[in-house]
Every structure is written in structure tokens, then in C-alpha cells.
């Protein structure tokens, strides 16, 4: 029965970009300005998204598809379909409740977005700090202290080749 009814439903003939107008004997009427229907058989058209303020229009609304927004320079998109615009900060900063603030000592952020993350703890992997961290960069871990003892292998670039029969002191 349901299938038979849907076959007889005049609204199912209304294509995308139109709606089935109950006030006009279920005639397919074009979507009014600033509205769209992306599928056929719709009884109403949806209001187009407006890109205002920090939101910029990336793609205009049409009768069959919604507008798409991105963010004005200095802001970046968050969420599906750019549902939010969030201010960029500088590298070495994070966005807090009071705006962009420098990363605390021991943390870094190498991007214009996101939060400050703790420096890698080299000692957890049995390694030593090769290059100190900054607000913008993580530490670089080097060989473990044991690797640096004489005669031990190292992750530093190999020394120039020696003559056969000579061992490193």
C-alpha cells in the first residue's frame, strides 16, 4: 500500500530546486530566492546559509545546493562544513579564554591553531635531549646516554671511514 501511494504521490515528480506546493494543488514550484532543495519530492525549500562577519562565501547558494562558507584571513574553520571560525594565533601560542597566549614553559605549538602540547620527555625512551625545545618547537631527542659512552654505537652520522686495522679509541 505504501509503495502504491508513493507511486501516486505527485510530489515525487518534483525535482531538486523545486518544492511541492500544497497551496497550488501540489504543483512543483521553484524554490524562492535565498532557498534551495537538494533532493526531489521536497514539500519545502531550505533557507540558504548566509556567510556573514568572519564567514566568507566560498560557494554561492543555488536552487539545488546550499551556500558554503570559509573563514576570513586570520581565522580558520572548525567543525563539519566550516560550522565555526576561530581566530589564528602565532606559532608558540594557543587560544585561551582571554585570547592568544604564549605557551607555558615546557610546552609548544608549531601551528597557528590548536593547543600547546608538552615537550617530548626524551628520558622516557631512554634518550637524551639533543636540541632543547622552544615555544614553537618540540625537543629533539638524541642517543641515549649509554650510547654516548666510548665504544658504543651511536645514532649520530657515521664518522669518516678509517683505514683497515684501526679501531676507534
Amino acid at each position: 500500500f505504501e509503495r502504491t501511494r508513493s507511486l501516486q504521490d505527485p510530489c515525487s515528480n518534483c525535482p531538486a530546486g523545486t518544492f511541492c506546493d500544497n497551496n497550488r494543488n501540489q504543483i512543483c514550484s521553484p524554490c524562492p530566492p535565498n532557498s534551495f532543495s537538494s533532493a526531489g519530492g521536497q514539500r519545502t525549500c531550505d533557507i540558504c546559509r548566509q556567510c556573514k562577519g568572519v564567514f566568507r562565501t566560498r560557494k554561492e547558494c543555488s536552487s539545488t545546493s546550499n551556500a558554503e562558507c570559509d573563514c576570513t584571513p586570520g581565522f580558520h574553520c572548525l567543525g563539519a562544513g566550516c560550522s565555526m571560525c576561530e581566530q589564528d594565533c602565532k606559532q608558540g601560542q594557543e587560544l585561551t579564554k582571554k585570547g592568544c597566549k604564549d605557551c607555558c614553559f615546557g610546552t609548544f605549538n608549531d601551528q597557528k591553531r590548536g593547543i600547546c602540547r608538552p615537550w617530548t620527555n626524551c628520558s622516557l625512551d631512554g634518550k637524551s635531549v639533543l636540541v632543547n625545545g622552544t615555544k614553537e618547537r618540540d625537543v629533539v631527542c638524541g642517543p641515549s646516554p649509554a650510547d654516548l659512552s666510548p665504544g658504543a654505537s651511536s645514532v649520530t652520522p657515521p664518522a669518516p671511514a678509517r683505514e683497515p686495522g684501526h679501531s676507534p679509541q
Epitope: 546559509r49 556573514k52 562577519g53 568572519v54 564567514f55 562558507c69 581565522f75 572548525l78 567543525g79 562544513g81 566550516c82 560550522s83 565555526m84 571560525c85 576561530e86 581566530q87 587560544l95 585561551t96 579564554k97 582571554k98 585570547g99 592568544c100
Partner: nanobody, 122 residues
């Protein structure tokens, strides 16, 4: 329909003062946090000040101590009192709802006014 209408912009000398108003309609103003942002040609948007529904406020470092945001829930209006204006304050100022209540963030359901121009010139 939701409407935000800014007024009070104009030409002012450096060191002068202006009061911007934003008249809201079409929503329950008293329960919304509100914001002022500005757009400097060629420099993009920056947030200026925020005010929560309870009246607590936040300011950008660049305007702290010079600008004051306030609201009158009986008049459905938010204000920006600007003192000691500088050349770098010259911009189009926008009033907007602030649903995210995260500094520097607006969402797609926020409403924006049309903006009012503030020109600082000697």
C-alpha cells in the same frame, strides 16, 4: 527575523571618544552573550570585546583600559564606549551574537550587524 543594527560611528580626532550602539531584535537578547569585532581594510577581522548575559566582560589587549562594553537588557542594546581613540582603531565595527562563548570563535548561527565605520583622523 533577527536583526542587529549598529550606529554611532563617525569621524573622530586621535584621543577622542565615540559610543557605538547595537540595537537587537528578533531574539531573547538578555540570554545571549554579545560581541564587538572590527575589520581593518587589508588586515582582516579581530575581536574587540565580549559581554556575557550576566554582564561579565572580556577585552582584546589592544583596547583594554580604553574601550568599555556594556549592555542594557531592557533596551535590547549593547554598547561599545571607545575612549583615547588611536589611528589604529580606525575600522568597520560589527556587533554579533556570540554563541560559542569562546574568545576568537563565532559559529554559523551567530547573527551579525551591517557594521558602522569609525574613522580616526586629525
Amino acid at each position: 527575523a533577527v536583526q542587529l543594527v549598529e550606529s554611532g560611528g563617525g569621524l573622530v580626532q586621535p584621543g577622542g571618544s565615540l559610543r557605538l550602539s547595537c540595537a537587537a531584535s528578533g531574539f531573547t537578547f538578555s540570554s545571549y552573550a554579545m560581541s564587538w569585532a572590527r575589520q581593518v581594510p587589508g588586515k582582516g577581522f579581530e575581536w574587540v570585546a565580549y559581554i556575557y548575559s550576566d554582564g561579565s566582560t572580556y577585552y582584546a589587549d589592544s583596547v583594554k583600559g580604553r574601550f568599555t562594553i556594556s549592555r542594557d537588557n531592557a533596551k535590547d542594546t549593547v554598547y561599545l564606549h571607545m575612549n583615547s581613540l588611536k589611528f589604529e582603531d580606525m575600522a568597520v565595527y560589527y556587533c554579533a551574537t556570540w554563541r560559542s562563548q569562546q574568545v576568537g570563535r563565532w559559529d554559523e548561527y551567530d547573527h551579525w550587524g551591517q557594521g558602522t565605520q569609525v574613522t580616526v583622523s586629525s
